[in-house]
């Protein structure tokens, strides 16, 4: 990388035009963020905030159960993920204020902007994993008695981790550091060394792996165990149907936009004025996927509120009651409430 | 009428420093970049540096270590000063300009300076 | 850095040919801002560069239209219409979207 003596932040964005103007310098630039960017930078504030202290607490909630409870593995996990990809932001929020100018080297390029891939591949396979266990414990409860243990659920959290990092290196090996001649500044993004066909290719794999197939299975999978537990009148809670609904729409609602973008740019080039617009939205799309960050906490508490009635507990031992209450598996056929209340909490997040 | 115009030493011991000046005219030093390239049978066209308008400067990484960019705003100078020079090191020397458009090409170049290295 | 390639090396043309050089770069040359900062020049024997065209296909001030830039991404071409006297000497393409602007070695049009 050639050397860079990044001495003056007052460069900005540097929109350039086609016009010969004799009365604006080239090397005079806009110090202005724009909208998009702003909107991003407010976003990242709240969910590293959120996040970190939400996902530190349900660690710390879960992490003592964790042996015992299953639940409470799916839980810990989840936020493990989601605690990792916050710790990016400070970083992730430093750039966007310099203009999107990049000091922190190739390294950290590589790692801290794919940490939130990381997480979408880690959250969607956690929560297929977990799906997996509520549709078992409705369909298959006698083989649960026997199998499901804590060593099980372990072991099924290591491969969802194994494939989420597996999933990543594309994203990962891509990054580089480019670095502009004017206005000064080095960026830090994806390089397919114009090779649009594997840039499509990166682009839909990540579509359909960490978007369409498993909002797919999700659907049928919770449409499924839903219309069960209704025909079983196991129970009839609304708060059951409203908490799965939040925790499965919010990571499909939230990686949306980034997504969508993604694939348009990959088909688009990069001199397109489409191309331009979509590159401009690109962080606040980011900050908006990071909004995953720090849901589930938040879907927690508000699913806590309302097992509970009003808040009277203390927020760990709302977090508590919610994230490890273990799902009891009968030899008959039906099931306690408690079964189907677990459903409610994040562990099928989506 | 934009000019640029460079003076140096023409001839340069090994191991010793060289110092061009390029002075211009037809436009401000306080607006505009002012780049340094250099030409040489072995190397062809290779870019120096910039010192831009609000005094930030950018090298060549290959270079860095014994190259300085500088310049005199009210004089309408800018300096090039360089290291330890070797014999690779001898080329004509170019000051060049982007005024007036927004292409970042070097719109405008001084008649060079050629720098010998030798004893 | 990146790397600038020019073929041909050397192109021998009758004067009212059409000549055609080819650049092609190691990486993209789009900038963020969706420009592409690939620019041509024209170097005569004992002269400076002048430039000729800039950002890929526009022509810089007082430079004849029978010259033309097109291209994106890595790979461009500059045309010469119908080649004049005037027109003889050493083409350079060249890049400043990255750091460090970077050259072609040169393409030398002469007479056949």
């Known amino acids: 990388m050639d050397s860079f003596n990044y001495t003056t932040p007052d460069y900005g964005h540097y929109d350039d035009k086609d016009t010969l103007d004799l009365n604006t310098p080239v090397d005079k630039t806009s110090n202005t963020l724009r909208v998009p960017d702003i909107l991003a930078l407010v976003i990242f504030a709240v969910v590293f905030l959120v996040g970190v202290l939400g996902n530190a607490l349900v660690v710390w909630v879960t992490a003592f159960e964790a042996k015992r409870t299953i639940n409470a593995i799916w839980f810990l996990n989840l936020a493990v993920a989601d605690f990792l990809s916050c710790l990016a932001l400070p970083i992730l929020f430093t750039s966007i204020v310099q203009h999107h100018h990049w000091p922190f080297g190739g390294a950290a390029c590589s790692i801290l902007p794919s940490l939130i891939l990381l997480n979408m591949y880690a959250s969607i396979l956690l929560l297929a994993t977990i799906s997996a266990d509520r549709f078992l414990l409705v369909f298959k409860p006698i083989w649960c008695q026997n199998f499901r243990g804590a060593g099980l659920a372990w072991i099924a959290c290591a491969v969802a981790w194994g494939l989420a990092l597996l999933l990543t290196i594309p994203s990962f090996l891509y990054r580089v550091v480019r670095e502009e001649y004017f206005p000064p500044k080095v960026l830090c993004g994806v390089d397919y060394s114009h090779d649009k066909r594997r840039e499509r290719a990166v682009a839909i794999v990540r579509l359909v792996l960490g978007f369409l197939w498993p909002l797919l299975t999700l659907t049928i999978c919770y449409t499924f165990i839903l219309l069960r537990t209704w025909s079983r009148r196991a129970t009839r809670s609304t708060k059951t149907l409203k908490v799965v609904v939040a925790v499965v729409a919010s990571f499909f609602i939230f990686w949306l936009p980034y997504q969508v973008t993604g694939i348009m740019m990959s088909f688009l080039e990069p001199s397109s004025p489409t191309f331009l617009l979509l590159k401009k939205l690109d962080s606040l799309c980011v900050s908006f996927a990071y909004i995953n960050c720090c849901i589930n906490p938040i879907i927690y508490v508000v699913a806590g509120q309302g097992f509970q009635g009003r808040l009277r507990k203390s927020l760990p031992s709302l977090l508590r009651n919610v994230l490890t209450e273990e799902s009891v598996v009968r030899e008959s056929k039906s099931f306690t409430r408690s079964t189907v209340d677990t459903m409610a909490q994040k562990t099928q997040a989506v | 009428q934009v000019q640029l115009k460079e003076s140096g030493p023409g001839l340069v011991a090994p191991s010793q420093s060289l110092s061009i000046t390029c002075t211009v005219s037809?436009?401000?030093?306080?607006?505009?970049?002012v780049d340094w390239v250099r030409q040489s049978p072995g190397k062809g066209l290779e870019w120096l540096g910039v010192?831009?308008?609000?005094?930030?400067?950018n090298y060549n990484s290959a270079l860095k270590s014994r190259l300085s960019i500088s310049k005199d705003n009210s004089k309408s100078q800018v300096f090039l000063k360089m290291n330890s020079l070797q014999t690779d090191d001898a080329a004509m020397y170019y000051c060049?300009?982007?005024?007036?458009?927004?292409?970042?090409?070097?719109?405008?170049w001084g008649q060079g300076t050629l720098v010998t290295v030798s004893v | 850095d990146v790397v600038m390639t020019q073929t041909p090396l050397s192109l021998p043309v009758s004067l009212g040919d059409q000549a055609s050089i080819s650049c092609r770069s190691s990486?993209?040359?789009?900038?963020?801002?969706?420009?592409?900062?690939l620019h041509w020049y024209l170097q005569k024997p004992g002269q400076s560069p002048k430039l000729l065209i800039y950002?890929?296909?526009n022509r810089f001030s007082g430079v004849p239209d029978r010259f033309s830039g097109s291209g994106s991404g890595t790979h461009f071409t500059l045309k010469i219409s119908r080649v004049e006297a005037e027109d003889l000497g050493i083409y350079f393409c060249?890049?400043?979207?990255?750091?460090?602007?970077?050259f072609g070695g040169g393409t030398k049009l002469e007479i056949k």
């Open positions: 990486q993209s040359l789009v900038h963020s801002s969706g420009n592409t900062y």
């Open positions: 060249s890049q400043s979207t990255l750091v460090p602007p970077t």
């Open positions: 010192i831009w308008g609000v005094g930030s400067t």
């Open positions: 060049a300009s982007h005024y007036g458009y927004d292409g970042l090409g070097f719109a405008y």
């Open positions: 037809g436009f401000s030093l306080t607006s505009y970049g």
């Open positions: 950002k890929v296909s």
